[in-house]
Structures are given as C-alpha cells and as structure tokens.
C-alpha cells in the first residue's frame, strides 16, 4: 500500500530590508495567471542569490505570499501584485504561507526500527 502525502501549512511573518541586491525574488500568480488551479494567489517562483530573501533564509520557492506590509494580495492582477512589491519601500513585511510535504507511511505499517509496543 502506498503512503499518503499530506501537507503541513504554516504561516510566518518575515521582515526584510531591501539591500543593494533588493529583496531578490520573483513571483507568479494573480487573477489573470493562476499558478495553482483555482487559486489566484501570489507565489514565490525564484529566489536570487545575495538578495535580502536569500540572505535571510526563511522565504522559500513555492511559498504563498498572503500580504505585503499588511496589504492583502487576494484578487490582484499579476502586474498589480508586482507593482505593489516594487512600491513597498525599504522595509518590507511579508505574511507568508509555507506548505511542507509530509509523507505518511501505509496504515498499519510498522517500520523496522519501531518498538513493538
């Protein structure tokens, strides 16, 4: 029997400061170019070396960005979301949703190293 793939969803507030290499990431998504089916949210597509996001280390490719400086990113056109980030200023607060994949074993399976109880 195959294991079931579950997801652990967590949220985090990440405060970044634009350095010489900027925040240093790219986004996908928006009402006009959905990245995830039936979800017009904004996602991190790429993190650039030496940018503030990479140096901070918490933001990951695939993370969903829920808000920027308290401004909700729901129902935005892609370019409007890009513009919101670009106009967000020097100190930027991101509310981020991480989606971590959790592999569960088959029901009733006991691993070799498990105690017999």
């Amino acid at each position: 029997m195959n294991g079931r793939v579950d997801y652990l969803v967590t949220e985090e507030e990440i405060n970044l400061t634009r350095g010489p290499s900027g925040l240093g990431f790219n986004i996908v998504g928006g009402t006009d170019q959905q990245y995830v089916s039936n979800d017009s949210g904004i996602y991190v597509s790429r993190i650039k070396e030496n940018g503030a996001a990479a140096l901070d280390g918490r933001l990951q490719e695939g993370d969903k960005i829920l808000s920027v400086n308290g401004q909700d990113l729901k129902n935005l056109l892609h370019q409007d979301a890009v513009d919101l980030f670009r106009n967000a200023g020097y100190a930027v607060s991101l509310r981020v949703q991480h989606r971590l994949q959790v592999q569960n074993g088959p029901i009733g399976h006991r691993g070799e190293g498990d105690p017999s109880g």
Partner: nanobody, 125 residues
Framework: EVQLVESGGGLVQAGGSLRLSCVAS????????MGWFRQAPGKEREFVAA????????DYPDSVKGRFTISRDNAKNTVYLQMNGLKPEDTAVYYC???????????????????WGQGTQVTVS
Amino acid sequence: EVQLVESGGGLVQAGGSLRLSCVASGGTFSSYDMGWFRQAPGKEREFVAAINWSGGSTDYPDSVKGRFTISRDNAKNTVYLQMNGLKPEDTAVYYCASRWRSGVDPYYYAGTYDYWGQGTQVTVS
C-alpha cells in the same frame, strides 16, 4: 547564459539624437525584463530606463523622462533606447542589463540584474 551586446553609441552634438540597441542571445528573451544603465567617469552607475518582459510597462528616472524612450522587439531579441535632446551630462558608457521577469524590486536596483553587456560609449559635446 544570456549574452548582451550593445551598439549605437558615438559622438553627438548637444540637442542631437542617438538610438542604442542591445541584442540578447542564449536565453528566452521574452522572459526577461530589460534595463539601461549608464556610468560616467568617476561617478556611480545610474539607472536610465527599463521595460518589462512584454513591453507593457516602462520606467525612467526624472533626469531622462520625456527625452529617452525604451522599447523592445521580442521577435528580434532586441531592446532599444531612443535618446533625444541629448545634453553634455548624458555623456557616459551605456550598459544594457537583463533580469528574470516579475522581480519584486524596482528597476533601478542594479544589483537585481543577472546579466550585463560590455557597454557602448555615448559622448555629447
């Protein structure tokens, strides 16, 4: 790896015009935002113009707004900088740069660009 080659620089009198071109190779041109920067001797690199991947969005600093126009032809893998009403203070080496589309940083952040050309000299007398 993207290669960028600028051309079109030269010597021009004040009030004259030049059109710079930058041809890209080695990547999917239409996936990149493109920018022009310049650097005069002894001065810092300065943002001049930028255009997004589709050509639908442009940006200029106040120093060139109304005089310079950036455009692109994705079929020719080329970005252009039309410079009118040139002034002596426009004298500099002009560099073309590219960065992956939909970056979250303003265009004037030179450190966000991935690839740079070798530059073309513009001298306004």
